[in-house]
């Protein structure tokens, strides 16, 4: 049974040209995490595999950095980076847990972080 919950950084905003850290945390489960995927819509950005470590998709290598931890750092942000990002935890025996983050990239210098929230 899937008992875990994913806590994410929620709705966040950042300035164009800047960087942002996407973070998720899986709790309330003893399941083994075998891999974490970071995706934007249906595009795979990066993988953190328990055996192999990090793999960044070639098309994002210049602007995506692994970490901190299981998080992901997006750099040189553009307005086109605005949208939904997903952390997908592959675990055993529970299965797949998904967290959602919405990033808004702002032209102005007014960029505030949203509150953290829970996704069951």
């Amino acid at each position: 049974m899937m008992t875990g919950t994913i806590e994410t950084t929620g709705n966040i905003s950042a300035e164009k040209g800047g960087s942002i850290i996407l973070q998720c945390h899986l709790s309330s489960t003893t399941a083994q995490v075998t891999q974490v995927n970071w995706e934007q819509q249906d595009q795979l950005l990066a993988i953190c595999n328990a055996d192999l470590g990090w793999h960044i998709s070639p098309s994002f290598k210049d602007r995506v950095a692994p970490g901190p931890g299981l998080g992901l750092t997006l750099q040189s942000l553009t307005v086109n980076d605005t949208g939904e990002y997903f952390c997908i935890y592959h675990t055993y025996p529970d299965g797949t847990y998904t967290g959602r983050i919405f990033l808004e990239v702002l032209e102005s210098s007014v960029a505030e972080h949203g509150a953290r929230f829970q996704i069951p």
């Epitope: 075998t34 249906d42 993988i47 328990a50 055996d51 192999l52 592959h90 055993y92 299965g95």
Partner: antibody, heavy 119, light 107 residues
Framework: EVQVVESGGGLVKPGGSLRLSCAAS????????MSWVRQAPEQRLEWVAE????????FYSDTVTGRFTISRDNAKNTLYLQMNSLRAEDTAVYYC????????????WGQGTTVTVSS | DVQITQSPSSVSASVGDRVTINCRAS??????LAWYQQKPGKAPKLLIY???RLQSGVPSRFSGSGSGTDFTLTISSLQPEDFATYYC?????????FGGGTKLEIK
Amino acid sequence: EVQVVESGGGLVKPGGSLRLSCAASGFTFSTYAMSWVRQAPEQRLEWVAEISSGGSHTFYSDTVTGRFTISRDNAKNTLYLQMNSLRAEDTAVYYCARKTLDYYALDYWGQGTTVTVSS
Amino acid sequence: DVQITQSPSSVSASVGDRVTINCRASKSISKYLAWYQQKPGKAPKLLIYSGSRLQSGVPSRFSGSGSGTDFTLTISSLQPEDFATYYCQQHNEYPWTFGGGTKLEIK
């Protein structure tokens, strides 16, 4: 070209043992998690076991836990399934399959090897 | 375990027809359903995963839709090489489980 080829199937008596092998080629074997899936006659496909790319994580269906052992030799590009205490209900075609890099499905399968457990 | 009910178990159709195959999960599996094609004596072939993602090299006449418990595989215009057995599989939680298959036959 990605290829996975199973071998080692055959006829075995109940309580007996068998070791299946799966030879992989055409891809970097050590980068991919691998699975065994079986299909009994006139039955649906059944996931049996999985092993992570480096071999540090192994997972089993409840029906085979304690009897089957999945392992791999990345130097030989080979996946194994050691089957002990075999039962009649283990009779099936056994497929070796590669898990996608993003862990979502099984993207390349072998043709299968037949295991028959009968006295 | 998540039970997968696939329907119909068999369907007869002609080249050029539009065909749909359905799978229903016993509980929500989010979008995590894959579809495979298998021909007699051959290895299963991945067509669709995560509900609607088309596997590389698979013709665009194949499409997948659905989320939660109800999913559909659609073949928009049947080609001669599409006559085969199709299986769905949930990849949301362990053990991964499969539907019973749909045999697509020539009418």
